[in-house]
Interface confidence: low
Amino acid sequence: CLHFYASQVPPQYPPIQSIRVQFTRCENEKGCIITSPSKDETMKVQDNSIIINCDGFYLISLKGYFSEELSLSLYYRKGRGPLFSLSKVTSVDSIGVAYLAFKDKVYFNVTTHSTSYKDIQVNGGELILIHQNPGGFCAY
C-alpha cells in the first residue's frame, strides 16, 4: 500500500490556465457583468474581461437563460470579429474551441430588441475557458 503525504505530492506546474465566471446581469448595448466565484482561478478578470496570458487553443463553454430576447456576441480583440454570435435568443448553451493569444481579452457585447433600457437578468449564466495547450508560450 503506497501512501502519499502532502509534501510528497509532485506539484502540477504550471497549472492549466482555466477560469469559470458567472454573470447574473447584462446591460443593453454593453456587456454582461462577470464575476469569478473562486479565488483560485489561474486566469483573471479585469475590467469585465477575461485576460489571456497564454497562447493556444481554448475550450469555451457559454450557458445562460435571459429574462428577455437578446443578441449576444463574445469578443476577444477590438477590431476583430466575434468568437461567436447569437441573434435573438432567450438562452444559450454553446461550446466551442478558439485560438487566443497573450494580450487578448474575452468580453461580451449584448443588444436587446426592446425599447426599454432596463438590465437583462440572467439565470445560470456561466462562461468557462480552459487552455488546451499547456506548456505553450505564456506571459504574465
Partner: antibody, heavy 116, light 112 residues
Framework: AVQLVESGGDLVRPGGSLRLSCVAS????????MYWVRQAPGRGLQWVAT????????YSTDTVRGRFTISRDNARNTVYLQMNSLRVEDTAVFYC????FGLGYWGQGTLVTVSS | DIFMAQTPPSLSVSPRETASISCKAS???????????LDWYLQKPGQSPQLLIY???NRFPGVSDRFSGSGSGTGFTLRISRVEASDTGVYYC????????TFSQGTKLEIK
C-alpha cells in the same frame, strides 16, 4: 422538447414512506433550481420544497420540515422527494417543476394518497 | 410568509372581451437584487399548471401576446385580451421573492 416525468406516487398508510422521482430532459438540468409543488384534491397550489441548482441548498415548507427531504442527482438529471411519516393531509398530486425566473417547466404530477 | 390575495375568485367573460385579475401581496415583492419575482400561472382543467408571465410583465416563451402583466410593489394585474375558449381554467399568481414560495388561491375563468 422539455420534459419532466414524475413517478413514485402511491396509496400509503398514515406514518408510511414514499420516494418520489422526477426525471428531466430537454434542458440543462444542472442550471435550474428544482421545486416540488403539491395540490390537494380540489385545492390550490402549495410549495413543498426547493433544491438549488448545485444541490448545496435545500428549503422546505414548515408543515413538511423534518419529514420530507429533497435531493438531486445532476448526473442522472433527477430530483427526488423522500417523504416519511406521511399524514392524511399530505394527500395530493405532487408536481416537480424547474425554476428559471418563474416556475417554467412542470411535470404531469404523481398522485400520493395517504389513507388508512 | 407573504400572503397572496387574488380577486375575483371567479370570472365569467364573453369571447373577445378582456378579463382582468388582480393580485395583492401582504408585503412588497421588490427583491434586494432589483427584481420583482411575481409570476402568473394558468391551470387548465385536468392539466398541470403552466407559466404565463414572470418578473411581473415578461411573457414566457410560447405564451400568446394576449396575456399581459403589470404592477409593482404589492399590487399586480393580469390582463387577457380577446378572450378565447381555450383560456378557460384557474389562474394563480405566485411570488418567489421570499421563501416560502407562495401562491394565491386562484381565479376560475369561465368563457360564456
Amino acid at each position: 422538447a422539455v420534459q419532466l416525468v414524475e413517478s413514485g406516487g402511491d396509496l400509503v398508510r398514515p406514518g408510511g414512506s414514499l420516494r418520489l422521482s422526477c426525471v428531466a430532459s430537454g434542458f440543462t438540468f444542472s442550471n435550474f433550481d428544482m421545486y416540488w409543488v403539491r395540490q390537494a384534491p380540489g385545492r390550490g397550489l402549495q410549495w413543498v420544497a426547493t433544491i438549488s441548482y448545485d444541490g448545496f441548498n435545500t428549503y422546505s415548507t414548515d408543515t413538511v420540515r423534518g419529514r420530507f427531504t429533497i435531493s438531486r442527482d445532476n448526473a442522472r438529471n433527477t430530483v427526488y422527494l423522500q417523504m416519511n411519516s406521511l399524514r392524511v393531509e399530505d394527500t395530493a398530486v405532487f408536481y416537480c417543476t424547474a425554476r428559471r425566473f418563474g416556475l417554467g417547466y412542470w411535470g404531469q404530477g404523481t398522485l400520493v394518497t395517504v389513507s388508512s | 410568509d407573504i400572503f397572496m390575495a387574488q380577486t375575483p375568485p371567479s370570472l365569467s367573460v364573453s369571447p373577445r372581451e378582456t378579463a382582468s385579475i388582480s393580485c395583492k401581496a401582504s408585503q412588497s415583492l421588490l427583491h434586494s437584487d432589483g427584481n420583482t419575482y411575481l409570476d402568473w400561472y394558468l391551470q387548465k382543467p385536468g392539466q398541470s399548471p403552466q407559466l404565463l408571465i414572470y418578473l411581473v410583465s415578461n411573457r414566457f416563451p410560447g405564451v400568446s401576446d394576449r396575456f399581459s402583466g403589470s404592477g409593482s410593489g404589492t399590487g399586480f394585474t393580469l390582463r387577457i385580451s380577446r378572450v378565447e375558449a381555450s383560456d378557460t381554467g384557474v389562474y394563480y399568481c405566485g411570488q418567489g421573492t421570499q421563501l416560502p414560495y407562495t401562491f394565491s388561491q386562484g381565479t376560475k375563468l369561465e368563457i360564456k
